[in-house]
């Protein structure tokens, strides 16, 4: 690539999404944000759910949507695989429902490739331990 060509990938500046196995991204992300600061605004809405610990994959999954992986070799951003989305949803949607909230449409698992292959690259993410949900105090109104 010539020096005059715009760099395809940018460093991830969102602290929560650093040190997750990849360190560069390219906006717009998979939901349409042009700026990492705006992606971060959306990510903040999920912090209590991350702290709750419903899925060990949640943080990686959210980062892969809001700051998808970028590589100089491929023009398109690499987001999560549908399998990881479904795994996270299966474990975290009941927690959101417990709070009275619906799973967000922006994280609809059908939007993501079912699995990683040459036609549709995606990230499988770290393995999710198939153990019962931790008995943590839900971070919800009225509880510390």
């Amino acid at each position: 690539f010539g020096d005059e060509e715009e760099r395809r990938c940018d460093p991830i500046r969102i602290s929560m999404c650093q040190n997750l196995g990849y360190n560069v991204t390219k906006m717009p992300n998979l939901v349409g944000h042009e700026l990492q600061t705006d992606a971060e605004l959306q990510l903040t809405t999920f912090t209590p759910l991350i702290q709750y610990g419903c899925s060990s994959q949640l943080q990686f999954f959210l980062c892969s949507v809001y700051v998808p992986m970028c590589t100089e070799k491929i023009n398109i951003p690499i987001g999560p695989c549908g399998g990881m989305c479904l795994s996270v949803k299966r474990r975290c949607e009941p927690v959101l429902k417990e709070f009275g909230f619906a799973w967000p449409e922006s994280l609809n698992c059908s939007k993501f490739p079912p699995q990683n292959d040459h036609n549709h690259m995606c990230m499988e993410g770290p393995g999710d331990e198939e153990v019962p949900l931790p008995h943590k105090t839900p971070i919800q109104p009225g509880e510390e």
């Epitope: 602290s15 349409g32 600061t37 809405t45 999920f46 109104p141």
Partner: antibody
Framework: EVQLVESGGGLVQPGGSLRLSCAAS????????MHWVRQAPGKGLEWVAS????????SYADSVKGRFTISADTSKNTAYLQMNSLRAEDTAVYYC??????????WGQGTLVTVSS | DIQMTQSPSSLSASVGDRVTITCRAS??????VAWYQQKPGKAPKLLIY???SLYSGVPSRFSGSRSGTDFTLTISSLQPEDFATYYC?????????FGQGTKVEIK
């Protein structure tokens, strides 16, 4: 029960400073972003600033950038808004609000800041 | 900045009326829109989140919808306690912005 209690408002001269506090109870502010929103007399709502301790990040409205500083003391479960170089147009009721998945779901009662000579 | 243009700025209605308030975003905000109710001297209260989801404890006569960048708050049958000012808000991108507000008054 979730509660947000603002304090620190009052009458201040143009160019002066004030520090507003937002004491939270019933939840841990480390896990939420905390926002300040103001409302001038008889006017609508204006977002001022936000802080997310989890992300170590802050953001400001252009109208207050460089003059206001938002911070949080997680050990005291309190958010702050340091307001310097105050102007007449900063006169408003200042609310703090908790922000997460559904939006700003809990708000304080507000504290009035009046900038006048 | 994303502008949220809210209309009407005020309206007069009677108990039992169906009331519709609209908000248009100046650019795409996905479904990152909330609606709030505010009564004089009080803090705003969350009614609708994610454009169309009813917040916990809010009466079912309130509903929200989205069509592209147009967002609507509907009160199906206005009750005496619903006379207040309503605001839309986008939290898709910084700075977070509110609509100008709609004051719902008694006819």
């Amino acid at each position: 029960e979730v509660q947000l209690v603002e304090s620190g408002g009052g009458l201040v001269q143009p160019g002066g400073s004030l520090r507003l506090s937002c004491a939270a109870s019933g939840f841990n502010i480390s896990y939420y972003s905390m926002h300040w929103v103001r409302q001038a007399p008889g006017k609508g709502l204006e977002w001022v600033a936000s802080i997310s301790s989890y992300y170590s990040s802050t953001s400001y409205a252009d109208s207050v950038k460089g003059r206001f500083t938002i911070s949080a003391d997680t050990s005291k479960n309190t958010a702050y808004l340091q307001m310097n170089s105050l102007r007449a147009e900063d006169t408003a009721v200042y609310y703090c609000a908790r922000f997460w998945y559904p939006g700003m779901d809990y708000w304080g009662q507000g504290t009035l800041v009046t900038v006048s000579s | 900045d994303i502008q949220m243009t809210q209309s009407p700025s005020s309206l007069s209605a009677s108990v039992g009326d169906r009331v519709t308030i609209t908000c248009r975003a100046s650019q795409s905000v996905s479904s990152a829109v909330a609606w709030y109710q505010q009564k004089p001297g009080k803090a705003p209260k969350l009614l609708i989140y994610s454009a169309s989801s009813l917040y916990s404890g809010v009466p079912s006569r309130f509903s929200g919808s989205r069509s592209g960048t147009d967002f609507t708050l509907t009160i199906s049958s206005l009750q005496p306690e619903d006379f207040a000012t309503y605001y839309c808000q986008q939290h898709w991108s910084y700075p977070i912005t509110f609509g100008q507000g709609t004051k719902v008054e008694i006819k």
